[in-house]
Each structure stands twice: as C-alpha cells, then as structure tokens.
Interface confidence: low
C-alpha cells in the first residue's frame, strides 16, 4: 500500500489529524521534500547575519554576514570578524602579522614567507606583512650564456617594506 503522505508535495505537510490531508506549511516554515509530517522552522538571519535568500514554503532562508564579517562553517553557520590584509584574528582581536609572516586576505592566519634559499633561489621581492616573498632564479641560472634575466636585487634577509 502506498503511503498517502507520499503525495504531499514540498511546501506542505501531511496532517495526521485530518486524514492525511496535505496542509500548507505555517508561516515562517518550509518543507523541502514531499511526504513530510511537519514543517521545519525557517532560519532567521539576525544580528551579524544578513539575509541572502528569503525563506519560502519549499526552501530555507540563506544567510551571509554583514560587511566587516565573513562566513565560516557549512551554510554560513558563523560570522567571523574581518581583519585587514597583513593581520590575523586572535582572541584579542586583529593583530599585525609577526615578522616573517604575511596574510594577503581579510580572513585566515598569517603564513610564513617562502624561504627562497631552501630551493637554492635568491629573493627577488622581499616579503611584507601583506605579501609573500618572491623568489628569483638561482645564482647558477644567472651564469654567462644563460638566457637573459633582470638580475635580482642583492640577496639579503627579507624584511618588511618601510611602512
């Protein structure tokens, strides 16, 4: 025997109390699949959350974050404060990247600069708080007869650019 509730489409629930009549979901609720016996409550995008898509009778609301925050977690379950490039979010708030690290985004943590010498390369552009070091060719690549390249700046320990 077919379950009569299987005929109830998305946007309705199968009301046990009324001989399996398909009743529309109450306000602020939805059912995204057919045959449901109750409707799910709509997500409310409150506070730091902002409504990206309104709830309908067949689909939940979708939230994103207000300016200055970004989404974390599945379905934007959390909003985390943005920082500036060159910073990372700590328990104490946004902090500048420590020397030798960088962050080129408004989220995430500071990452160490690429260590060019590990690959036997020279430093073409020094790392800053906001950007990684750029490695140039290895000294061997610059020997006479090698294809012409602009010689790198004299190799030195990468440091922050003057602020």
């Amino acid at each position: 025997l077919q379950d009569p509730c299987s005929n109830c489409p998305a946007g309705t629930f199968c009301d046990n109390n009324r001989n399996q009549i398909c009743s529309p979901c109450p306000p602020n609720s939805f059912s995204s699949a057919g045959g449901q016996r109750t409707c799910d409550i709509c997500r409310q995008c409150k506070g730091v959350f902002r409504t990206r898509k309104e709830c309908s009778s067949t689909s939940n609301a979708e939230c994103d974050c207000t300016p200055g925050f970004h989404c974390l977690g599945a379905g934007c379950s959390m909003c985390e404060q943005d920082c500036k490039q060159g910073q990372e979010l700590t328990k104490q708030g946004c902090k500048d990247c420590r020397f030798g690290t960088f962050n080129d985004q408004k989220r995430g943590i500071c990452q160490p600069w690429t260590n060019c010498s590990l690959d036997g390369k020279s430093v073409l552009v020094n790392g800053t708080k906001e950007s990684d070091a750029v490695c140039g060719p290895s000294p061997a690549d610059l020997s006479p007869g090698a294809s012409s390249v602009t010689p790198p700046a004299p190799a030195r320990e990468p440091g922050h650019s003057p602020q």
Epitope: F13, D15, P26, G35
Partner: antibody
Framework: QVQLKESGPGLVAPSQSLSITCTVS????????INWVRQPPGKGLEWLGV???????NYNSALKSRLSISKDNSKSQVFLKMNSLQTDDTARYYC???????????WGAGTTVTVSS | DIQMTQTTSSLSASLGDRVTFSCSAS??????LNWYQQKPDGTVKLLIY???SLHLGVPSRFSGSGSGTDYSLTISNLEPEDIATYYC?????????FGGGTKLEIK
Amino acid sequence: QVQLKESGPGLVAPSQSLSITCTVSGFSLTSYAINWVRQPPGKGLEWLGVLWPGGGTNYNSALKSRLSISKDNSKSQVFLKMNSLQTDDTARYYCARGSGTWYFDVWGAGTTVTVSS
Amino acid sequence: DIQMTQTTSSLSASLGDRVTFSCSASQGISNYLNWYQQKPDGTVKLLIYYTSSLHLGVPSRFSGSGSGTDYSLTISNLEPEDIATYYCQQYSKLPWTFGGGTKLEIK
C-alpha cells in the same frame, strides 16, 4: 503504534551533566520534530527545545547555553544533554513528537531527574 | 519571549457542569495555540490545536475558541475522567511557551 520512551540517570550531582535518551517507534525522525519539555515538582510545563526533521534545533532562550539536542535517525533516538545542573533542574523530563502545525501530538511518559549531592 | 498566563490556578466544578479555562498571551499569537491535558499520573495528551481544531480521538465535549491574545478551552459536560491539569501553549514565536496550568477538581 507510535511511542516515545525517555531514559535517564535518575540522580545527578550538582554541577554535573545530564544525558537523556528518547527512543521512538512507529514513525521516522526524518519526518517529525521532537520536542523536550520538563516539569519541576508541583510546577507547570516548560518547553526546553526542538529538534527538527532536517536536524536543526531551537532552544528555550533561558537554557540555550546549557542545552544540546541531537539524534541518531538510524537508531530512532534523540538525545538531550544539559550541562552545569543545579537543584532547580530537578524535574520530570518529557519528549514529545512535533507534528503538523507544531502541536505535540504524542508524549512519552517522562523520566524523573533529581539533582542532589 | 511570549508570556502565557492562565490566571486561575485551580477550578472546582461538579460532574455535568460546563467548565471554561482561560489563557492570555502577552502579545497577539494569531490563533497559534494548543491545549494539553495532564492527568494526575503525569500522562500528557493533546486536546486542541490551532485554537479550535479537535485532536483525533478527543471527545466532542471539548472545544476551543479565541483570537488575538485571549483564548479559552471549554468542557461542555464534565466527566470524572476529565479531572486533570490543563495547559495552553503558543507556537506563534519561538521559544514556544506554556501557560502555568489550571487544575480541575470535582466538587
């Protein structure tokens, strides 16, 4: 036949956590919501929270920080966890099926939880 | 949160009487109101949902009415098995809340 049955520890020491299981039969947790309601001795009913068919939850605002509701659809079980219990959490705890327009159409018999040292 | 108030904590009536329980909400709840019966042994049953819809298997002597903030449950012909405590509950806005209950006793 639709049934809900709560099982809990009976006695919990103050500041400890409470875990209660609601085992359901005769219906699927993927189609119905499950609510938790409690009743302190000699007092009225207090709604604690709801676990929706899709897995979402809503909680009583006064208890939100201490409550967690989850489920295992395959075992037809819903779990209530409450942290930092105090003596005023002593109550009978019920699970109830949420149906239709969110009426609680079938209730368990309840399980009594006493918070005492 | 919406507060639900059942002003009468206990009622005494005789068998065969018509008994009315009242329930008021701290704000309009658009008929999103249910009534439950709790027997002395703790068993809870749904009687009425959405203000006036009778739950399956509930005797027709029970009826509900109301709108806005004020709602009522009526038992038209009191029977011995109706001895219980009656609770209203709103589901207009989360968190859902119950009234304090009205205990019905026989004179």
